[in-house]
Amino acid sequence: TIQGTNRSSKGRSLIGKVDGTSHVTGKGVTVETVFSVDEFSASVLTGKLTTVFLPIVYTIVFVVGLPSNGMALWVFLFRTKKKHPAVIYMANLALADLLSVIWFPLKIAYHIHGNNWIYGEALCNVLIGFFYGNMYCSILFMTCLSVQRYWVIVNPMGHSRKKANIAIGISLAIWLLILLVTIPLYVVKQTIFIPALNITTCHDVLPEQLLVGDMFNYFLSLAIGVFLFPAFLTASAYVLMIRMLRSSAMDENSEKKRKRAIKLIVTVLAMYLICFTPSNLLLVVHYFLIKSQGQSHVYALYIVALCLSTLNSCIDPFVYYFVSHDFRDHAKNALLCRSVRTVKQMQVSLTSKKHSRKSSSYSSSSTTVKTSY
């Protein structure tokens, strides 16, 4: 978001008429309230970064994120008999990703058409609310999953209904929290008509000068409360987990668990480095610069960081892969275009040939699902 200049002589309330047009003159329109952007911001809004690079990234995220998270949600809801806390958190993670990714065709079209939003104020607000909602939901559910993974290693007790209920309660609390913290994004007017560029932007230009300080305080609060604190918890969980796995006995099974745990840690670390850290850092820096200088010199970086934050919808399936046996099996079979039933039949014939020898690494049973490493 960049700071737009309100050219209305009467000023405007928090939610007011922005791109209202009174009458047409020649080929243009006469605007009642108008916003102006600086040349650098205009060059970003009309340049290849926003009109070519962003739609490419969003298309990749949509093409990868929609089917993988859709399959994950289906697996966790209908193909996993025992709903362990990890399964519950991953199902919520997949749901958060889907709720964000389903709006991407509109986002892609918006950027391809030169950052011109033609779908109305309400849809823009929904898109932005879900965009940020997904990022913060992902951070919180990832934190829950990380803490839960550590808890499983420290306290390797069987599945209990109580644990699942606690996980459901925590998940509902997270959804409620995210709904509350994203309310300002739904309330604030996000679409602005820029006469100089003849485009209506969605979230890319800040509608109110009065909002500059509010937006800075808002994103700073979110960066501290919904990013830094959960990031610290996640990091702590993984540091303790590595310590536990290092000190544990090294048999073949625990070695596999350790390798998978390391892969999970690397995946989550990558997610923080690519998706969450740059976006949260640049959100704060960007709004601080607008608040203090009236313009942001990091606007292009901020745009890229927000774009990269959506990659979490593509990285999350790797988390499911390293945590859930069921998802791992369904993912393998989907990629190999095989059904789970076919694989099960193959396994039955293999086990009958090899007598009663167990192959734990290929276990895909829905009744005896293990979601630990």
């Epitope: 243009g28 006469t30 102006s36 100089a196 200088q293 009236g294």
Partner: antibody, heavy 119, light 106 residues
Framework: QVQLVQSGAEVKKPGSSVKVSCKAS????????VIWVRQAPGQGLEWMGV???????YYAQKFQGRVTITADESTSTAYMELSSLRSEDTAVYYC?????????????WGQGTLVTVSS | EIVLTQSPATLSLSPGERATLSCKAS??????LDWYQQKPGQAPRLLIY???SLATGIPARFSGSGSGRDFTLTISSLEPEDFAVYYC????????FGGGTKVEIK
Amino acid sequence: QVQLVQSGAEVKKPGSSVKVSCKASGFSLSSYGVIWVRQAPGQGLEWMGVIWGNGNTYYAQKFQGRVTITADESTSTAYMELSSLRSEDTAVYYCARWRGYKDYPFDYWGQGTLVTVSS
Amino acid sequence: EIVLTQSPATLSLSPGERATLSCKASQNVYKYLDWYQQKPGQAPRLLIYNTNSLATGIPARFSGSGSGRDFTLTISSLEPEDFAVYYCLQHNSGWTFGGGTKVEIK
């Protein structure tokens, strides 16, 4: 070089309209906006309105409904029409070039057109 | 609407003296403030834009400073041709001119 040449002085009756022209040279009207400013005798400068290179316009609230700014790219001329003239509209009207962006000033000005409203 | 207040209304100085003109905004305009010079019977001429950037062809004796709400135009050593009316203009939120400061020969 960049130049803005305005039409000559006008004497108008109250209630009538006046149309002031501003011919641009040395730059394209499709790439630049033109703003209009007026100055009553012995008074300060007053911003009236703007037309962008793409034809979009915006007027100061004080003049909304009375002012119309247009541009003709073929002749590189911008126009400002003020209707329902009153005696207090007696002023020198200036046009100026503007790049259309927030961080750009009004860098080149026309010589001004004196409009006298008198019965 | 942002109101710009220029002071003093009139500044009486001799050639060679330093002139300091003030422009105060009713709210933060960041760096988006320009200075214009106007001589009798002439159109305004851009001197300084975005607080401190010197416009093309303007002598180095003119300089601008400030940020936020308080801005200053300084003429280090007045030349005879510098005696005129000076206006500030903010373009951060709307376009508004200050009332002007007349720099006259003492």
